[in-house]
């Protein structure tokens, strides 16, 4: 048994006569043999679920669900209740109605075995019938909505009449009917005004019925029509077995470059026309089990269940359904030497499904784990300026497909054949598994015998110690020119173009800082600034070379304070700035200020 609504509303007036009928509550059957029996909770409740008083005023007919006044609610009774309402004015009280034999504790009132009946209290007597508007004669203030379980026996779930109005204003004639399309499963009995289902409903065919209730009021010669929505929602039960959309029960996957723990290797989708169990229960009752295979597979893979509500078209309307994505996920990082092929089976069980048929599906994943060979191009040829400053980035090395790698830890190293010409360093970038080549020793750059630098680049997979080698040939170009006196260590200090381009700074490949002219559009990522190389700084990312010294690119790497209009970077640096941004790394400060447009003019005049 279950209530067709979770809440009912009616009005209560002072001194309403004992015996006044108030409303009917309705229960629908889950099985044909069930007989409803109603009982009221013992207490009246007020604002914020405050227990006000034992219910001495309202009774229920256990077999029909009719609520009526057992005794008149006078002023003094009302005062008594108001005092207990924590100081709030008492506008609404409610009762709990239970369906026997459901032995719910009084404290809990959850649909389907309990409904709340709210009474709006009016501190006046029942108004004169002639003063009631048609809307008040026809329907309660709060519009009802109904919930009916699918596949259940048909039954009565509503009674249109406002009983107090019918009881106190017998001379006003009120008629009701339902506006509904052809073939809908509802009827309104003309005599009793009871609304019932004609047959069992199927949610998978239609989930919502947006009906309209029409009320016609006859008072003397006057006739008025009132229409209100009459929505019915069909509640789901687990009556559909899971299926494979388009019959696809097998997914094939290749694990190659993406070998990181938590990588989704393959996904299979299961469709279920039902939307139960509800989300809180779903993963517990809709189970997936990776069937025992070899131990390696059990340790290496896991299955993740990702249910999602979807909607499908049925008989011209949309109804909700569930798609379950079963993802085969790597449980650990896979070594690059791992090489095997296997078939994994996953058992999916809709444990609430009662049939006919089975609520069980078998998912198949065909997985090939390919080994990864480390390869470098045979030779790298690069050039570097003799004027390059320490930490200048001059190039990248990268094993084949390194951009696609994840879960593969490759470290790069340079082997130098000559101590006096060992100019370069390499650091491994975590982002793309590449190695960034940078100037580490500027003194070596200036030695005449170091016109060509020969290195071996060695890439090593940290897990297996497998290696790839390539030769690196670096040509040293240009001639060395000593820097002007008084230049700062960091390009970022310079606030104007002229002073910027006169100096070099840490990280500068040419030995000169570069000016980046911003777009002048408020707080922008493209702010004006002085940089060792606009290719790498600022780019919103403090790379692995820039982390080595805060003077290289404080615009990307500073953790200190930024003064002026800006948007801070995540987790550090300046994401966007206003005008020109310059920094003082030693003081851990950057300043973003409006462009100084007089600057070029002044320079011309001073000349």
């Amino acid at each position: 048994l279950y209530f067709s609504r979770d809440a009912y509303w009616e009005k209560l007036y002072v001194d309403q006569a004992a015996g006044t009928p108030l409303l009917y509550v309705h229960a629908l059957r889950d099985a044909p043999e069930e007989v409803p029996s109603f009982r009221l909770g013992q207490h009246l409740y007020g604002t914020y679920r405050t227990r006000l008083h034992e219910n001495n005023w309202i009774c229920i007919q256990e077999d029909t669900g009719l609520l009526y006044l057992n005794r008149s609610l006078d002023h003094s009774s009302w005062e008594k209740l108001s005092v207990r309402n924590r100081g709030f004015p008492l506008l609404t009280v409610y009762l709990k109605v239970f369906l026997s034999p459901t032995s719910l504790r009084e404290g809990e009132c959850q649909w389907p075995g309990c409904a709340r009946v709210y009474f709006s209290f009016f501190n006046t007597s029942f108004p004169a019938c002639s003063s009631l508007k048609p809307r008040e004669l026809c329907f309660p203030e709060t519009r009802p909505s109904f919930r009916i379980r699918e596949n259940r026996p048909p039954g009565t779930f509503h009674q249109f009449r406002l009983l107090p109005v019918q009881f106190l204003c017998p001379n006003i004639s009120v008629a009701y009917r339902l506006l509904e399309g052809e073939g809908l499963p509802f009827r309104c009995a003309p005599d009793s005004l009871e609304v019932s289902t004609r047959w069992a409903l199927d949610r998978e065919q239609r989930e919502k019925y947006e009906l309209v209730a029409v009320c016609t009021v006859h008072a003397g010669a006057r006739e008025e029509v009132v229409m209100v929505p009459f929505p019915v929602t069909v509640y789901d039960e687990d009556d559909s077995a899971p299926t494979f959309p388009a019959g696809v029960d097998t997914a094939s996957a290749v694990v190659e470059f993406k070998r990181k723990e938590d990588t989704v290797v393959a996904t299979l989708r299961v469709f279920d026309a039902d939307v139960v169990p509800a989300s809180g229960e779903l993963v517990r009752r809709y189970t997936s089990t990776l069937l025992p295979g070899d131990t390696w597979a059990q340790q290496t893979f896991r299955v993740e269940h990702w249910p999602n509500e979807t909607s499908v078209q049925a008989n011209g309307s949309f109804v909700r359904a569930t798609v379950h994505d079963y993802r085969l996920v790597l449980n650990r990082n896979l070594s690059i030497s791992e090489n095997r092929t296997m078939q994994l089976a996953v058992l999916v069980n809709d444990s609430d499904f009662q049939g006919p048929g089975a609520g069980v599906l078998l998912l198949h994943f065909n997985v090939s784990v390919l080994p990864v060979s480390l390869h470098l191009p045979s030779t790298y040829s690069l050039s570097v300026s003799r004027r390059a400053r320490r930490f200048a980035q001059i190039g990248k090395v990268c094993v084949e497909n390194c951009q696609a790698f994840s879960g593969i830890n490759v470290q790069y190293k340079l082997h130098s054949s000559g101590a006096n010409c060992s100019t370069l360093g390499v650091v491994t970038s975590a982002e793309d598994t590449s190695g960034i080549l940078f100037v580490n020793d500027t003194k070596a750059l200036r030695r005449p015998k170091c016109a060509e630098l020969h290195y071996m680049v060695v890439a090593t997979d940290q897990q297996t110690s497998r290696q790839a080698q390539a030769q690196l040939l670096v040509t040293v170009e240009g001639s060395y020119v000593a820097e002007e006196a008084g230049c700062p260590l960091s390009c970022a200090v310079s606030k104007r173009r002229l002073e910027c381009e006169e100096c070099g700074g840490l990280g500068s490949p040419t030995g000169r800082c570069e000016w980046r002219q911003g777009d002048g559009k408020g707080i922008t990522r493209n702010f004006s600034t002085c940089s060792p190389s606009t290719k790498t700084c600022p780019d919103g990312h403090c790379d692995v070379v820039e982390t080595q010294d805060i003077n290289i690119c404080p615009q990307d790497c500073l953790r200190g304070s930024i003064v002026g209009g800006h948007e801070p970077g995540e987790p550090r640096g300046i994401k966007a700035g206003y005008g020109t941004c310059n920094c003082f790394p030693e003081e851990e400060k950057c300043f973003c200020e409006p462009e100084d447009i007089q600057d070029p003019l002044c320079d011309e005049l001073c000349r």
């Epitope: 045979s378 030779t379 190293k413 082997h415 130098s416 054949s417 000559g418 101590a419 006096n420 010409c421 015998k449 170091c450 060509e452 630098l453 020969h454 071996m456 060695v458 080698q469 390539a470 030769q471 040939l473």
Partner: antibody
Framework: DVQLQESGPGLVKPSQSLSLTCTVT?????????WNWIRQFPGNKLEWMAY???????GYNPSLKSRISVTRDTSKNQFFLQLSSVTTEDTATYYC???????????WGQGTLVTVSA | DVQITQSPSYLAASPGETITINCRAS??????LAWYQEKPGKTNKLLIY???TLQSGIPSRFSGSGSGTDFTLTISSLEPEDFAMYYC?????????FGGGTKLEIK
Amino acid sequence: DVQLQESGPGLVKPSQSLSLTCTVTGFSITSDYAWNWIRQFPGNKLEWMAYITYSGDTGYNPSLKSRISVTRDTSKNQFFLQLSSVTTEDTATYYCARGNYDWVFAYWGQGTLVTVSA
Amino acid sequence: DVQITQSPSYLAASPGETITINCRASKSISKYLAWYQEKPGKTNKLLIYSGSTLQSGIPSRFSGSGSGTDFTLTISSLEPEDFAMYYCQQYIEYPWTFGGGTKLEIK
């Protein structure tokens, strides 16, 4: 002037390990350059085998990678070659050589003949 | 690996003559080729590197030329001590590889 001298057993049994020593005089192996092993097969074909740099970094010919190892003893100014699981195909004259900055072999030892035979 | 084909494998000449030995690489190695001399009872000697740069202490009658894939060692006005085994070696691509050698003998 820098001089290199190879030493080790002239005869090794198949499946055993071949161990050679290169003793360097006139130059410290930790101060500069790469120090190499090269071998010459009976038909005169030369094959570069491995290096160890002044800083201790090692590199190996991929064709030998699984069975070769180069180490050094800085206190004795020596570097060593170990080649495991030898076969008769490893019969050759083994040379140690010093590289230049460009990996070219500027100085060579006299060479030592190693025969692999049962 | 870069294959180095050296020719001829055998050469007979008389003192005072000029001879050439050729090396061809299976792919471009730019200028990164070295030439060595091997004589019995002596240590191998680096003659030329970077295709054409004479190693210090090597007589000027030895010269090298070429780049890319084709290289030549020229010995002008042969001296008696020049009769030996000669090898070329590429050192731009790992692993470094040698030519098969040329035996220069007195005619």
